[in-house]
Interface confidence: medium
């Protein structure tokens, strides 16, 4: 029995004075606690606890379930204990079958013995199956068998406590080990969409998916730069062992412009944290913004092709698109398509394909688009470059030679005189008058230029050339002169195309 210095409170003394006591089933357990300040006896085994306020604990007919630790406590809180084994060949183990452990921690298989003198106290797999090779355990007859450093692979492992009794192996009831996984990585988080664009009053709903090994992962939606608690709804599933999924849905039933911003789905476990964001933009009304992909003033050569291309942002989605020229709507020759197949796409492309344009097809080509909120339009001014065409070349009554040419860009008219029979007309003649005339055709059509020279300047036989040219090409007309005495005659005016 313990001895202490006089004057100090001492722990109670127990009779019989030994740390362990073995009795047979059916025998009497008689324990005496001696202490002037006796308070109580406490009995503990597994999760069971009993108390007795008498200083003598008597169990007349001991049963296996009376196996356990008997503790006597005095008024000073000092105590002394004795462990009693009630040997019952028919009940070698006391069991609490709830067996669970945290990964990488130790866990106790609670199968204390009723007889400490049996041998080979150990664990065995169910149905003769071997235990995992790396499973290590430490037996303790009073507590059970401690499994060291539980592995995730042990989850749902079926096992028995086992002892050898009189040369035979005796098994306890079976235990199923349930392993709670340790967090060895941060949660995996993803969001239904990275960005949202809404009109005021529309519902904003976004779902964050959190995946982890167990349901103890924490998650929440947060508004960046705000502490306000957001309303969220959860659903969760266990997809088998160690595969937990939670969906956290954030909803704003009627979004306002000031709800715009960045929302973060945050998740953490004991290993670390992860987050993902989504951006909400709320506009007071829809919009359309058009961006021309080519210059809105277009120059194209006669007979060539041109594509008029626009990109536009439209929210809500576009409902009507059309291309118009001279108050006529194109029914074909154009296509309209989304810039991407992304669900949140608001950018679209429209292309008008103009083929083998004629000089008469210049003008304003307009793209119109509308949605439920707004209309928008953009105009392209298309100029068709044409080589000059000489419309008239005449000798006027007043003796002037006049040449009228049309083309785009505006033609320049030069005059040349070829004396006699020379083929090359190199001597240039300055015009008396040059005028740009208003065309009676559509706008963006050919420009008409009129140029005149005074024929009295010519004193010899020869040919006068009127040459009209621009960036596209040139055309000439010729006046042949022959002198008869003092009279000058214009003979056979004719044109020659000079490429």
């Amino acid at each position: 029995q313990p001895s202490v210095s006089p004057g100090e409170p001492s722990p109670p003394s127990i009779h019989p004075g030994k740390s362990d006591l073995i009795v047979r089933v059916g025998d009497e357990i008689r324990l005496l606690c001696t202490d002037p300040g006796f308070v109580k006896w406490t009995f503990e085994i597994l999760d069971e606890t009993n108390e007795n306020k008498q200083n003598e604990w008597i169990t007349e007919k001991a049963e296996a379930t009376n196996t356990g630790k008997y503790t006597c406590t005095n008024k000073h809180g000092l105590s002394n204990s004795i462990y009693v084994f009630v040997r019952d060949p028919a009940k070698l183990f006391l069991v609490d079958r709830s067996l669970y452990g945290k990964e990488d921690n130790d866990t106790l298989v609670r199968c204390p013995l009723t007889d400490p003198e049996v041998t080979n106290y150990s664990l065995k797999g169910c149905q003769g199956k071997p235990l995992p090779k790396d499973l290590r355990f430490i037996p303790d007859p009073k507590a059970g068998i401690m499994i060291k450093s539980v592995k995730r692979a042990y989850h749902r492992l079926c096992l028995h406590c086992s002892v050898d009794q009189e040369g035979k192996s005796v098994l306890s009831e079976k235990f199923i080990l349930k392993v709670r996984p340790a967090f060895k990585a941060v949660p995996v988080v993803s969001v239904s969409k990275a960005s949202y664009l809404l009109r005021e009053g529309e519902e904003f709903t976004v779902t964050c998916t959190i995946k982890d090994v167990s349901s103890s992962v924490y998650s929440t939606w947060k508004r960046e730069n705000s502490q306000t608690k957001l309303q969220e709804k959860y659903n969760s599933w266990h997809h088998g062992d160690f595969n937990y999924e939670r969906q956290a849905t954030l909803t704003i039933s009627s979004a306002r412009v000031n709800d715009s911003g960045v929302f973060m789905c945050y998740a953490n476990n004991t290993f670390g944290s992860a987050n993902v964001t989504t951006t909400l933009e709320v506009v007071d009304k829809g919009f359309i913004n058009i961006f021309p992909m080519i210059n809105t003033t277009v120059f194209v050569n006669d007979g060539e092709n041109v594509d008029l291309i626009v990109e536009y942002e439209a929210f809500p989605k576009p409902e009507h698109q059309q291309w118009i020229y001279m108050n006529r709507t194109f029914t074909d020759k154009w296509e309209d398509y989304p810039k991407s197949e992304n669900e949140s796409n608001i950018r679209y492309v429209s292309e008008l394909h103009l083929t083998r344009l004629k000089g008469t097809e210049g003008g304003t080509y307009t793209f119109l688009v509308s949605n439920s909120d707004v209309n928008a339009a953009i105009a392209f001014n298309v100029y068709v470059n044409t080589k000059p065409e000489i419309l008239t070349y005449d000798r006027l009554v007043n003796g002037m030679l006049q040449c009228v040419a049309a083309g785009f860009p505006e033609p320049t008219i030069d005059w040349y005189f070829c004396p006699g029979t020379e083929q090359r007309c190199s001597a240039s003649v300055l015009p008396v008058d040059v005028q740009t005339l208003n065309s009676s055709g559509p706008p963006f059509g050919k420009l008409v230029v009129q140029s005149s020279i005074d024929s009295s300047a010519f004193k010899h036989n020869g040919t006068v050339e009127c040459k009209a040219y621009n960036d596209v090409g040139k055309t000439s007309a010729y006046f042949n002169f022959a002198f008869k005495g003092n009279n000058k005659e214009q003979i056979h005016p004719h044109t020659l195309f000079t490429p």
């Epitope: 709670r180 959860y234 599933w237």
Partner: antibody, heavy 120, light 107 residues
Framework: EVQLLESGGGLVQPGGSLRLSCAAS????????MSWVRQAPGKGLEWVSA????????YYADSVKGRFTISRDNSKNTLYLQMNSLRAEDTAVYYC?????????????WGQGTLVTVSS | DIQMTQSPSSLSASVGDRVTITCRAS??????LNWYQQKPGKAPKLLIY???SLHSGVPSRFSGSGSGTDFTLTISSLQPEDFATYYC?????????FGGGTKVEIK
Amino acid sequence: EVQLLESGGGLVQPGGSLRLSCAASGFSFSSYAMSWVRQAPGKGLEWVSAISGTGGNTYYADSVKGRFTISRDNSKNTLYLQMNSLRAEDTAVYYCARRNDFWSDAFDIWGQGTLVTVSS
Amino acid sequence: DIQMTQSPSSLSASVGDRVTITCRASQNIYTYLNWYQQKPGKAPKLLIYDASSLHSGVPSRFSGSGSGTDFTLTISSLQPEDFATYYCQQSYSSSITFGGGTKVEIK
């Protein structure tokens, strides 16, 4: 001893409010998710709401969503259920229960229940 | 929500009888299935968790089996204190659901 003790039940008129409390003892309260489960007279069990150990995550049955709010105060070891816009069909015995994550999320500890009667 | 269908809704049996109660889930819930016992005027008590694991302190005459969608609670030898109502419950989804209950009465 592990124990849950509900309080706050009583008679309330339709449209009224009531706040139930559940005092926990004998275990590490903040380590466990908690739930409310109800049982209408002569009927079966119906899960109402749940809350994670930290209080960060809450769950509700469709029948009470928007009307009931579950919360907890881990410093006081207490679980709450705020019930607003009560209806006659909310009449039931309300139990609080501890959800044990180890055990297939089973409710391993239950309170004795508190009766809520919604009637005019 | 996952529907849990229990059968039968009630049964009469004698002490010593073997009693079997079945529970069917409307979708695969693996082994996330628990069984409870409730006596009149009392709170439910957990009997079986994880479809087949016996909860601490529950007599070994109770056993559970099954996985996926079909589950069974068996009482190998009915005792007088076992007359009660039994409920199954799925915890696979966060929206927890119970079966309708099976009342075990004395024949």
